[in-house]
């Protein structure tokens, strides 16, 4: 349904508060270096303009597209060339090329200072002094650091952020109330950002078909009682929502997400029995709840899959008539029967099935050719099962920190060209799979673990894409979305790598390490471990363990010393010498 003024339409649909918040997120995600005050000014100007269009949709410029309006506004920023360099060239382009240009310049790893959390009293004062500015600043800081954050979900985070301050700034022990809530929001926010980044990468790098396949599999697992036609409708709508958000069309995205939540709740009887509680919540909570809802129970008496997809003489006829629909039905039927499989495994099975049909439907005896296709699935299913079993055993044996270290060594040996901060970040996140998933029973382990690993490996892929240094990473990241994890798992030690020159400065530590949090201290040690492996890629586990144990003892000793700095200087030299000797450097 065409509207005379798109900006007026979205303003009316979303309301002023959400409109302003979403425009701020959009601008901060595009111009990640701009100061907060500049963005607020731009948002206010756009909002005032939108109000004139609501009053009179025929007013000047009200008929322009949102991309045109927002792009024109962004291009008024005076310091565009100095701050963003070649991104300023986007402004010479016309829509839709201009928006595409802005999208291409989104930076997954912007050079921004780490967000330091002020004292609780300072935060509470700021919250009370100007609640609106305080919350806008939250949106701005998150959006600029996470340029693909799912905007309607960020509104939900902001609502929880506000609720935390409203409650805790009145509490007797403000810190005890607030800090755990902020930690939870931070951790959930990082996870949400990473999950959405994978969706956008899927759409942008592998196309709509890849995203739709993912959505069919996931929604079929979640809503196994829903008919295929219903799942297909939800997939189409969900694809539109994520395409919009990943494309920077945040107003349309938020509006369509709300419509989708409304539709799901109006039709929950034919979708899932688990939606009742979600559908009683307000909009933002409702949408979040639906996105996280547990899988419904599988219908009783589901027939054999083989009947329609292997034994039937009509397989090739059905496939030829509508390939994607037939493959979609296969994926739907397989996924609804297998909540115990990861989505990526289901997609691998569907790909194997498709490849078999492509080959067999051209053969002299198609049925004879594809009769054993399900046998080909067995090794594909067993590979992640075995990998998860082995790694959960290792995790239970080592604990999270040492499990992360094992992964750090493993991945540094696979792709030593990758920057140390990236290897540390990715390996730490890979290691979190243990505490996240190994506690689950067998039936939930694979969907938890492998789909989580897909999210983490996508972080590696997007960070590496910005500054490509390893052909092996590029290959695993670009060849197949669903085979990324098996591709990385299959990598052995990179024999072509020339060890990094030894630099004593890398292994020089100071007393400041003693005041760091446990997490920060771990990161320091893990950074040193990666550097060790880069210097000595052929070092054995035992050698590395010995050096790391010595290093931990050194830090502990010097942090207890009266003259910490002297201890770090003197004992540090001894440690470096001993480590060089131990590793034969």
């Amino acid at each position: 349904d065409a509207h005379k003024s798109e900006v007026a339409h979205r303003f009316k649909d979303l309301g002023e508060e959400n409109f302003k918040a979403l425009v701020l997120i959009a601008f901060a995600q595009y111009l990640q270096q701009c100061p907060f005050e500049d963005h607020v000014k731009l948002v206010n100007e756009v909002t005032e303009f939108a109000k004139t269009c609501v009053a009179d949709e025929s007013a000047e410029n009200c008929d322009k597209s949102l991309h045109t309006l927002f792009g024109d506004k962004l291009c008024t920023v005076a310091t565009l060339r100095e701050t963003y360099g070649e991104m300023a060239d986007c402004c010479a382009k016309q829509e839709p090329e201009r928006n595409e240009c802005f999208l291409q310049h989104k930076d997954d790893n912007p050079n921004l200072p780490r967000l330091v959390r002020p004292e609780v009293d300072v935060m509470c004062t700021a919250f009370h002094d100007n609640e609106e500015t305080f919350l806008k600043k939250y949106l701005y800081e998150i959006a600029r650091r996470h340029p693909y954050f799912y905007a309607p979900e960020l509104l939900f985070f902001a609502k929880r952020y506000k609720a935390a301050f409203t409650e805790c700034c009145q509490a007797a022990d403000k810190a005890a109330c607030l800090l755990p809530k902020l930690d939870e929001l931070r951790d959930e926010g990082k996870a949400s950002s990473a999950k959405q980044r994978l969706k956008c990468a899927s759409l942008q790098k592998f196309g709509e078909r890849a995203f739709k396949a993912w959505a069919v599999a996931r929604l079929s697992q979640r809503f196994p009682k829903a008919e295929f036609a219903e799942v297909s409708k939800l997939v189409t709508d969900l694809t539109k929502v994520h395409t919009e958000c990943c494309h920077g069309d945040l107003l349309e995205c938020a509006d369509d997400r709300a419509d989708l939540a409304k539709y799901i709740c109006e039709n929950q009887d034919s979708i899932s029995s688990k939606l009742k509680e979600c559908c009683e919540k307000p909009l933002l909570e409702k949408s979040h709840c639906i996105a996280e809802v547990e899988n419904d129970e599988m219908p009783a008496d589901l027939p054999s899959l083989a009947a329609d997809f292997v034994e039937s003489k009509d397989v090739c006829k059905n496939y030829a008539e509508a390939k994607d629909v037939f493959l979609g039905m296969f994926l739907y039927e397989y996924a609804r029967r297998h909540p115990d499989y990861s989505v990526v495994l289901l997609l691998r099975l569907a790909k194997t099935y498709e490849t078999t049909l492509e080959k067999c439907c051209a053969a002299a005896d198609p049925h004879e050719c594809y009769a054993k296709v399900f046998d080909e699935f067995k090794p594909l299913v067993e590979e992640p099962q075995n990998l998860i079993k082995q790694n959960c055993e290792l995790f239970e044996q080592l604990g999270e920190y040492k499990f992360q270290n094992a992964l750090l060594v493993r991945y540094t040996k696979k792709v030593p060209q990758v920057s140390t901060p990236t290897l540390v970040e990715v390996s730490r996140n890979l290691g979190k799979v243990g505490s996240k998933c190994c506690k689950h029973p067998e039936a939930k382990r694979m969907p938890c673990a492998e789909d989580y690993l897909s999210v983490v490996l996508n972080q590696l892929c997007v960070l590496h894409e910005k500054t490509p240094v390893s052909d092996r990473v590029t290959k695993c990241c670009t060849e197949s979305l669903v085979n990324r994890r098996p591709c990385f798992s299959a990598l052995e030690v990179d024999e072509t790598y020339v060890p990094k020159e030894f630099n004593a400065e890398t292994f020089t530590f100071h007393a400041d390490i003693c005041t760091l949090s446990e997490k920060e201290r771990q990161i320091k040690k893990q950074t040193a471990l990666v550097e060790l492996v880069k210097h000595k890629p052929k070092a054995t586990k035992e050698q590395l363990k010995a050096v790391m144990d010595d290093f931990a003892a050194f830090v502990e000793k010097c942090c207890k010393a009266d003259d910490k700095e002297t201890c770090f200087a003197e004992e540090g030299k001894k440690l470096v010498a001993a480590s060089q000797a131990a590793l034969g450097l």
């Epitope: 295929f228 008496d301 589901l302 027939p303 054999s304 899959l305 083989a306 009947a307 329609d308 997809f309 292997v310 034994e311 039937s312 003489k313 009509d314 006829k317 059905n318 039905m329 039927e333």
Partner: antibody
Framework: EVQLVESGGGLVQPGGSLRLSCAAS????????MGWVRQAPGKGLEYIGI???????YYASWAKGRFTISRDNSKNTVYLQMNSLRAEDTATYFC???????????????WGQGTLVTVSS | DIQMTQSPSSLSASVGDRVTITCQSS????????LSWYQQKPGQPPKLLIY???DLASGVPSRFSGSGSGTDFTLTISSLQPEDFATYYC???????????FGGGTKLTVK
């Protein structure tokens, strides 16, 4: 007792619609393809179409577009929706259980008693 | 459309006779053997006798047998019994489930 029972037949005017039901008892419909076959008074058997266990439908060329087969496994029932009915559609309509699950083998080993549909003004 | 031709269309025989009915399809049936035979008595639904050209359906007496392949098939009743007087139909399954077809029928009556 394992059986199929058709219902929904009766007198209908030309151009009208009718939905026939076939309820299964004593077994689950989800394990076999279910077909519909008709027999005009004093004539032979005529295949209409079939629905597979997974819901794939296949129709005789003459039935395509006017007739629709569906199933509701939770109700253990198969349906035949008939539109734009003509006098020549007057027949006893049988539902039948195929030996196969995913296609029509032509071997229907369990039949209902049939329901008579009369198309007349 | 695929045609199934049964012959004869009617046949008179006596108890104890050996009876043969043939069925010819205009195209080869699926896997060369996807052919069934049915018996129907007035006011009753059809009853499956033979499937896959020669396999006897459950509960069917062994005097009934089927043979043939491709396009030509035969139903044989080795020794006719009083309860065998009925109409017999063949049905073929083809490479598409849409093409399943019945023969015109053979009415077997008492001579």
């Amino acid at each position: 007792e394992v059986q199929l029972v058709e219902s929904g037949g009766g007198l209908v005017q030309p151009g009208g619609s009718l939905r026939l039901s076939c309820a299964a008892s004593g077994f689950s419909l989800s394990s076999n393809a279910m077909g519909w076959v008709r027999q005009a008074p004093g004539k032979g058997l005529e295949y209409i179409g079939i629905i597979s266990v997974g819901g794939f439908t296949y129709y005789a060329s003459w039935a395509k577009g006017r007739f629709t087969i569906s199933r509701d496994n939770s109700k253990n029932t198969v349906y035949l929706q008939m539109n734009s009915l003509r006098a020549e559609d007057t027949a006893t309509y049988f539902c039948a259980r195929d030996r196969h699950g995913g296609d029509s083998s032509g071997a229907f080993y369990l039949w209902g008693q049939g329901t008579l549909v009369t198309v007349s003004s | 459309d695929i045609q199934m031709t049964q012959s004869p269309s009617s046949l008179s025989a006596s108890v104890g006779d050996r009876v043969t009915i043939t069925c010819q399809s205009s195209e080869s049936v699926y896997s060369n053997n996807q052919l069934s035979w049915y018996q129907q008595k007035p006011g009753q639904p059809p009853k499956l006798l033979i499937y896959d050209a020669s396999d006897l359906a459950s509960g069917v007496p062994s005097r009934f047998s089927g043979s043939g392949s491709g396009t030509d098939f035969t139903l044989t009743i080795s020794s006719l019994q009083p309860e065998d007087f009925a109409t017999y139909y063949c049905a073929g399954g083809f490479s598409s489930s849409s093409d399943t077809a019945f023969g015109g029928g053979t009415k077997l009556t008492v001579k």
